[in-house]
């Protein structure tokens, strides 16, 4: 069975084809090759003789037991080599020779028992080494690591490391890898020698499900003393053994680390007193809780010095009391409990993401809701009912505003966005908005992107609501049940590049409303009911137009519409997916491609 | 279509069939078997995925006695610092995991419950597997 040609001459997918040897009928120009799940078993010298251009090679689950000297020799362009799930028993010293550009080596679940004997010391270009799910017992980083000066990611998770000693990290003292991210999760740790991490600098350290008791956790965290880490991730996994007890003593040792960003990811434990618990983390710049349950919500009004707070997928009794002077970014998403938003006091806040919480807002939006006048980014998408009772008083700095899939009330009663002269991006898609007021977008003079799909208009008619949006480049009006539009609806949109009118109820096409769109490049009219043209003579679309989508419409392939069908043929170079432009009527031509139709109509004498 | 039996409990019988053409082997055990009146137990899964599990989600299509419920999307793996350790599993890596579950106080009416589970993962998104579970419910007292 042949391999699947994904990108001709470049990418080949040969997964699970029962190959016992490397295929010999693929072009020399192949750059990406997936040979996973084939019983190759043995890689001899110059196994990839015929693949000089190879960049990505996937050998996952190929039952490889032996890799000989020079197996990948002369693959000088290879950047990614994946060996996941191979029961390697014999790995020659020169197994990885010739890989002069290798950046990513994945040797997950390959029976690797030690880093010491892993022959990768010459791979100077290596950026990512993943040796997770192996049998490694010692965390001693071998001397050859001093050659791996580009290493950024080292994944040692799910191994058998129990202890870390001062000597294990000696090589890092000799060549501080300023950018190294280290994942030690799911190793059964019980001892970290104090001083082992002293004066070590890491970009990221992840320790999840490493400790089987609170005491072990406490002593191991104390053993991290002296570490300088940009981002520290602690926590557990839902499907692994969890700590039976967790209290403030667990994290006391963090006072002896220098941490820029902290994240606690999943804890099967109710956090009650977070002030005491995170006492050593009051001055990290970014603080993040993922999938934890928080009992006392008042604690977030303590004088923490955080600039970024992230609360994701957490459980709260009610919406937390947030009073944080220095906070610039707040991400509060996918949380449960506390369905009603209550005012927060965050005077420095610039970025606020409150999406996916099922929250309802009694009144939105003004500076008193968020306690700031500095807000630039506000995401309230995928929430409950949001009643628009204020026109963003004090929030004039806003540049990005997203309400999609929330239920907006009172949107068409006044110019809600009147004061948002700096707004660049607005998404009100699927917000149950019924446009009945022409001044709905007044004030949005800087707006570049407007998404309003899935809403409705009075009498299914698009009026002149965009007159002030002179900088608009992207407009989505899909799924709005539109049947007609004002001939001057788009007259002021001379910068518009993309217009999506798909999934509406237009029965005819007219070029007239688009005559002023001098920058229009993409016009999507798919999934309408277009049968013919509005006027007998269709003009040309703007000369800038490059893509016109008329697929899945109800073309009437009859003589009376011959000029329209001819006009469509004349637009051939603009049309996308022409094979999905089919006749709907008459019944004998139903399903026939419009462009292949040869309509010869007799003139009645 | 071959039917794979999972388990029987006092009020339910659970089995599944594959609804994709690949039918990559997957081993599912529930201990103790689910009782629909209330249940607490462990779900054990052994599986070798054909793609990375990063950004795994399930599309669930549930039918209750021939009545179709709306499609549900259950996100399991968001893509970073996920709740489940198997979210970091790579294509070809053995996934051998136990997940605890519990629910109580749901009253199910007697009948046949079908649940099609489409597992989607990776970037670009592609189907990982598709299983159709059938639960025959015989409530002893309802």
């Amino acid at each position: 069975e042949p391999c699947v040609e994904v990108v001709p001459n470049i990418t080949y997918q040969c997964m699970e084809l029962n190959f016992y040897k490397i295929p010999d009928n693929l072009p020399f120009s192949t750059k990406n090759l997936d040979l996973s799940f084939n019983p190759l078993r043995h890689l001899g010298s110059y196994s990839f003789f015929s693949f000089p251009e190879l960049q990505v090679l996937d050998l996952s689950r190929c039952e490889i037991q032996t890799i000989e000297d020079g197996a990948y020799q002369s693959l000088s362009h290879l950047s990614t080599l994946i060996l996941t799930g191979n029961p390697i028993q014999s790995l020659a010293l020169g197994a990885f020779s010739g890989l002069s550009s290798l950046q990513k080596l994945v040797a997950v679940e390959t029976n690797l028992a030690s880093l010491e004997n892993f022959p990768i010391g010459h791979l100077k270009t290596l950026k990512e080494l993943n040796v997770a799910h192996n049998l490694i017992q010692s965390f001693k980083l071998p001397e050859y690591f001093s050659n791996l000066t580009n290493l950024e990611h080292l994944d040692l998770s799910s191994n058998k490391i129990q202890s870390i000693y001062c000597t294990d990290l000696r090589v890092l003292h000799q060549m501080p890898l300023l950018n190294l991210s280290l994942d030690l999760s799911l190793n059964p740790m019980n001892f970290i020698q104090p001083g082992a991490f002293k004066e070590i600098r890491l970009h990221k350290l992840t320790l999840r499900n490493n400790f089987d008791s609170l005491n072990v956790m406490k002593t191991c965290i104390q053993g991290l003393a002296g570490l300088e880490v940009h981002r520290l991730v602690l926590g557990e996994f839902r499907n692994e053994g969890n700590l039976e007890k967790f209290d403030k003593s667990a994290l006391e040792g963090l006072c002896n680390l220098t941490i820029e960003e902290f994240r606690l990811a999943y804890l099967d434990y109710y956090l009650d007193d977070i002030i005491d618990l995170f006492n050593c983390l009051t001055n990290v710049s970014s603080f993040s809780l993922v999938s934890v349950t928080i009992e006392r919500v008042k604690d977030f009004s303590y004088n923490f010095g955080w600039q970024h707070l992230e609360l994701v997928n957490c459980k709260f009794g009610q919406f937390p009391t947030l009073k944080l002077k220095s906070l610039k970014r707040l991400t509060f998403t996918s949380n449960k409990g506390g369905n009603a938003f209550s005012e927060v006091d965050l005077p420095s806040l610039e970025f606020l993401d409150l999406s996916r919480n099922g929250l309802s807002f009694k009144g939105c939006c003004s500076q008193s809701d968020f306690g700031t006048t500095s807000l630039k980014y506000l995401d309230l998408s995928f929430n409950g009912v949001i009643t628009m009772s204020s026109n963003f008083l004090g929030l004039e700095q806003l540049e990005h505003l997203d309400f999609q899939h929330s239920n907006l009330k009172q949107m068409s009663e006044f110019s809600v966005f009147l004061s948002l002269r700096n707004l660049i991006y607005l998404d009100i898609s699927h917000t149950h908005t019924r446009v009945a007021f022409n001044g709905i977008f007044n004030g949005l003079s800087s707006l570049e992107v407007l998404k309003m799909a899935g809403n409705s208009f009075q009498e299914n008619f698009l009026p002149d609501i965009f007159t002030e949006l002179r900088n608009l480049t992207f407009l989505d009006l899909s799924q709005c049940q539109l049947e007609q539009l004002s001939p001057t609806a788009f007259n002021s949109l001379s910068s518009l590049q993309v217009l999506n009118m798909s999934h509406n109820n237009f029965f005819s096409l007219d070029t007239f409303p688009y005559k002023c769109l001098n920058s229009l490049q993409v016009l999507d009219y798919s999934l309408n009911h277009i049968m013919t043209s509005k006027k007998q003579e269709l003009q040309h679309f703007p000369s800038s137009l490059a893509f016109l989508n008329l697929t899945q419409n109800d073309f009437a392939c009859t003589c009376e519409h011959q000029s329209f069908l001819q006009w469509i043929k004349d637009q051939r170079q603009l049309l996308v997916e022409v094979e999905r432009m089919e006749c709907a009527t008459p019944s004998d031509k139903q399903g026939m491609p419009v462009l292949s139709l040869n309509i010869t109509c007799q003139m009645n004498k | 279509q071959k039917q794979y039996w999972v388990c029987n409990s006092s009020d339910a019988s659970i089995s599944y069939t594959y609804c994709d053409k690949m039918q990559y082997p997957i081993s599912i055990n529930v201990n103790p078997c689910i009782e629909l009146k209330r249940s607490k137990g462990l779900l054990h899964i052994f599986y070798i995925p054909r793609r990375d599990l990063k950004q795994l989600y399930f599309n669930l299509y549930i039918t209750v006695n021939t009545m179709n419920l709306p499609k549900r999307k259950e996100v399991i793996c968001r893509g970073s610092d996920d709740d489940y350790s198997f979210c970091r599993a790579l294509k070809g890596e053995t996934v051998n995991t136990t997940i605890s579950f519990s629910f109580k106080g749901i009253k199910f009416s007697k009948g046949k419950y079908k649940c099609v589970v489409e597992a989607i993962s990776g970037s670009p998104e592609e189907m990982l597997f598709c299983l159709e579970f059938v639960i025959l419910h015989q409530p002893n007292s309802n």
């Epitope: 040897k21 020399f28 001899g44 110059y46 015929s50 | -």
Partner: nanobody, 117 residues
Framework: EVQLVESGGGLVQPGGSLRLSCAAS????????MGWFRQAPGKEREHVAL????????YYADSVKGRFTISRDNAKNTVYLQMNSLRPEDTAVYYC??????????WGQGTQVTVSS
């Protein structure tokens, strides 16, 4: 078994030309691809050019494109490498290699090419 014998190497001035030959003998029916590789002192062996016996498709490394030409004479079981516009950086031992249908690779003993004024 496949035996490969190279010839044609030597000393040449920059801008000059050489033609290398590689004669194959033994189980030549099993050969799928043949090619020229080179190895400069202290460096890894690298692809120069490849040719597929079955359909004649060809590959050249970027560094030799437009200057070197690989060809084959099936009647003589020989593969050639015509090297024009030679540069000092082309100095290396040139090896002929052959890959069989069983993924086994055979090598010649190598021939020295030196480009120097």
């Amino acid at each position: 078994e496949v035996q490969l014998v190279e010839s044609g190497g030597g000393l040449v001035q920059p801008g000059g030309s050489l033609r290398l030959s590689c004669a194959a003998s033994g189980s030549i029916f099993s050969i799928n691809d043949m090619g020229w590789f080179r190895q400069a002192p202290g460096k890894e062996r690298e692809h120069v050019a490849l040719i597929r016996i079955k359909d004649g498709s060809i590959y050249y490394a970027d560094s030799v494109k437009g200057r070197f030409t690989i060809s084959r004479d099936n009647a003589k079981n020989t593969v050639y490498l015509q090297m024009n516009s030679l540069r000092p950086e082309d100095t290396a031992v040139y090896y002929c290699g052959a890959k069989t249908g069983t993924s086994f690779v055979y090598w010649g003993q190598g021939t020295q090419v030196t480009v120097s004024s």
